[in-house]
Interface confidence: low
């Protein structure tokens, strides 16, 4: 009589999370009499997965009728697979007795669970930075299996190279997480730019997941300031303009000072957007020249996005004020104009 064999034909089975897994097991003989049990893992710490005689195993069903006479097929189906079900499953034959005695084990079937990565979440820097500075973006995705995964970063469609990526844990696990950091050098044209974190995994069947972040959340484009005087009007009033250009975000406060005294303060709001996403703003100040005996020093002071104020000053000459005064007066810069 040939020796009893417990046959687990598949060395490995890979199943998508949520699906059912079929673990095949057959025996070559009905003799000796005794039950079959399924375990996950080997050795003293193994976990009982299915025992026909006793126990409650709601997710496990036999593939064929185990009570049928001459049944030699002890395959099982495990429903609603999760990553926690991964492991090696053994079909074990026992000889009937008091207690039953383990007789022979199958070679084992390794169940691996294919689980999709979560949608990548991209987070940017906590504070804004200006052009020429480097900012970091982080991308995270969790819960995937197997461990092999590809993550790429793009800025406006171009792949980024200054990237550091880690997949955790390093050892074997039921599921994995990926965390990647990309360093991006900002330019003044980046208000409309976007970074994309793209994750490719076997479970996604060639359709990668993407997470995005807008550089508008990370960038500050400081304004350029220019103060100019328009022609003097017939009523001895001079119109001085302060042009604040190419700034982002819109949060900006402008203050006019006459000879160091605050004349007017304005807050920017509802400005039209330039093509590159930045904003422009022009503020006017009317100066009554006849009310002054001496030259008037006008200062346009701009506080942008909570940063230190930038000043641009301008002197209106009143000593000899002909009716048509041109723009030949001097402007002086008393602040630092960030570029």
């Amino acid at each position: 009589e040939e020796e009893l064999q417990v046959i687990q034909p598949e060395k490995s089975v890979s199943v998508a999370a949520g699906d059912s897994a079929t673990l095949n097991c057959t025996v070559s003989s009905l003799i000796p009499v005794g039950p079959i049990q399924w375990f996950r893992g080997a050795g003293p710490g193994r976990e009982l997965i299915y025992n026909l005689k006793e126990g409650h195993f709601p997710r496990v069903t036999p593939v064929s009728d185990p009570t049928k006479r001459n049944n030699m097929d002890f395959s099982i189906r495990i429903s609603n697979i999760t990553p926690a079900d991964a492991g090696t499953y053994y079909c074990v034959k026992f000889r009937k007795g008091s207690p039953d005695v383990e007789l022979k084990s199958g070679a084992g079937t390794e169940l691996s669970v294919r689980a999709k990565p979560s949608a990548p979440v991209v987070s940017g820097p906590a504070v804004r930075a200006t052009a020429e500075h480097t900012v970091s973006f982080t991308c995270e995705s969790h819960g995937f299996s197997p461990r092999d995964i590809t993550l790429k970063w793009f800025k406006n469609g171009n792949e980024l190279s200054d990237v550091q990526t880690n997949v955790d844990p390093a050892g074997k696990s039921v599921s994995y997480s990926i965390r990647s950091t990309a360093r991006v050098v900002l330019t003044r044209r980046d208000v409309h730019s976007q970074v994309i974190c793209e994750v490719a995994h076997v479970t996604l069947q060639g359709d990668p997941l993407r997470g995005t972040a807008n550089l508008s959340e990370a960038i500050r484009v400081p304004p350029f300031l220019e103060v100019t005087q328009q022609s003097m009007r017939a009523d001895n009033q001079v119109n001085v303009t302060c042009q604040v250009t190419k700034f982002y975000p819109q949060r900006l406060q402008l203050t006019w000072l006459e000879n160091g005294n605050v004349s007017r303060t304005e807050m920017a709001s509802a400005l039209p957007e330039n093509k590159d996403g930045t904003y422009n703003w022009t503020s006017w100040l009317l100066v009554n020249v006849s009310a002054h005996r001496d030259d008037v020093k006008l200062t346009c002071q701009v506080e942008h996005d909570g940063q230190p104020a930038v000043n641009k000053s301008f002197s209106v000459k009143v000593s000899a004020h002909p009716k048509e005064q041109g723009s030949n007066t001097a402007a002086e810069n008393t602040g630092t104009n960030e570029r």
């Epitope: 040939e2 064999q5 046959i7 687990q8 034909p9 598949e10 060395k11 490995s12 089975v13 095949n24 057959t26 025996v27 070559s28 003989s29 030699m72 097929d73 199958g106 070679a107």
Partner: antibody
Framework: QSMEESGGRLVTPGTPLTLTCTAS????????VSWVRQAPGKGLEWIGI??????ITAYASWAKGRFTISKTSTTVDLTITSPTTEDTATYFC?????????????WGPGTLVTVSL | AFDLTQTPSSVEAPVGGTVIIKCQAS??????LAWYQQKPGQPPKLLIY???TLASGVSSRFKGSGSETQFPLTISDLESADAATYYC??????????FGGGTEVVVK
């Protein structure tokens, strides 16, 4: 221990054909038996297997639905359900070294199937 | 889909020479790989299983090695009787029971 295929012949496309593999010197309940084919001048192509001790079968993905494997106590059958001219080949049956270790230490000599109008 | 790529498709070497045939798996199959020799008009003959174990009665001039995805077969001290086509086969479960495309060995 030996195996021998029979049933190969000239058939017209669409006419089902059953090939039989007869084993001697060992019990089919203890070993898996596979069918492998080889088109003229081409390589070996695994079709499927039936395992010992049960009627569990497994097929190559390209062969599912095109072939059926079944067995009795002494024979294993391969049915080509609807042959096409691409099924013209020599068909071998092969015994697994052990049940579940499916490399083949015993092969039949092969039987030629020709599918032609 | 899983596949086995065999290279080269044909190789020629003199009597007494050595040939190396490579078999590459598209994913890891541990050591579940066998090698066969087939001569015209005959069924394949098992040479090696478990990547490196010689089958009964096979000459030690045949040497299999490798694991995971790369599996070379070396035939040394070639004899004219070694002229044949050689096939690798994965048996890592039925989903990956596949033969390589074959390598014809010509002995001069």
């Amino acid at each position: 221990q030996s195996m021998e295929e029979s049933g190969g012949r000239l058939v017209t496309p669409g006419t089902p054909l059953t090939l039989t593999c007869t084993a001697s010197g060992f019990s089919l309940s203890n070993y898996g038996v596979s069918w492998v084919r080889q088109a003229p001048g081409k390589g070996l192509e695994w079709i499927g297997i039936i395992y010992g001790g049960s009627d569990i079968t497994a097929y190559a993905s390209w062969a599912k639905g095109r072939f059926t494997i079944s067995k009795t106590s002494t024979t294993v059958d391969l049915t080509i359900t609807s042959p096409t001219t691409e099924d013209t080949a020599t068909y071998f049956c092969a015994k697994s070294y052990t049940n579940g270790m499916d490399y083949y230490n015993i092969w039949g000599p092969g039987t030629l199937v020709t599918v032609s109008l | 889909a899983f596949d086995l790529t065999q290279t080269p498709s044909s190789v020629e070497a003199p009597v007494g020479g050595t040939v190396i045939i490579k078999c590459q798996a598209s994913q890891s199959i541990s050591s579940y790989l066998a090698w066969y020799q087939q001569k015209p008009g005959q069924p394949p003959k098992l040479l090696i299983y478990s990547a490196s174990t010689l089958a009964s009665g096979v000459s030690s001039r045949f040497k299999g090695s490798g694991s995971e995805t790369q599996f070379p077969l070396t035939i040394s001290d070639l004899e004219s009787a070694d002229a044949a086509t050689y096939y690798c086969q994965s048996y890592y479960g039925s989903r990956s029971n596949v033969f390589g495309g074959g390598t014809e060995v010509v002995v001069k």
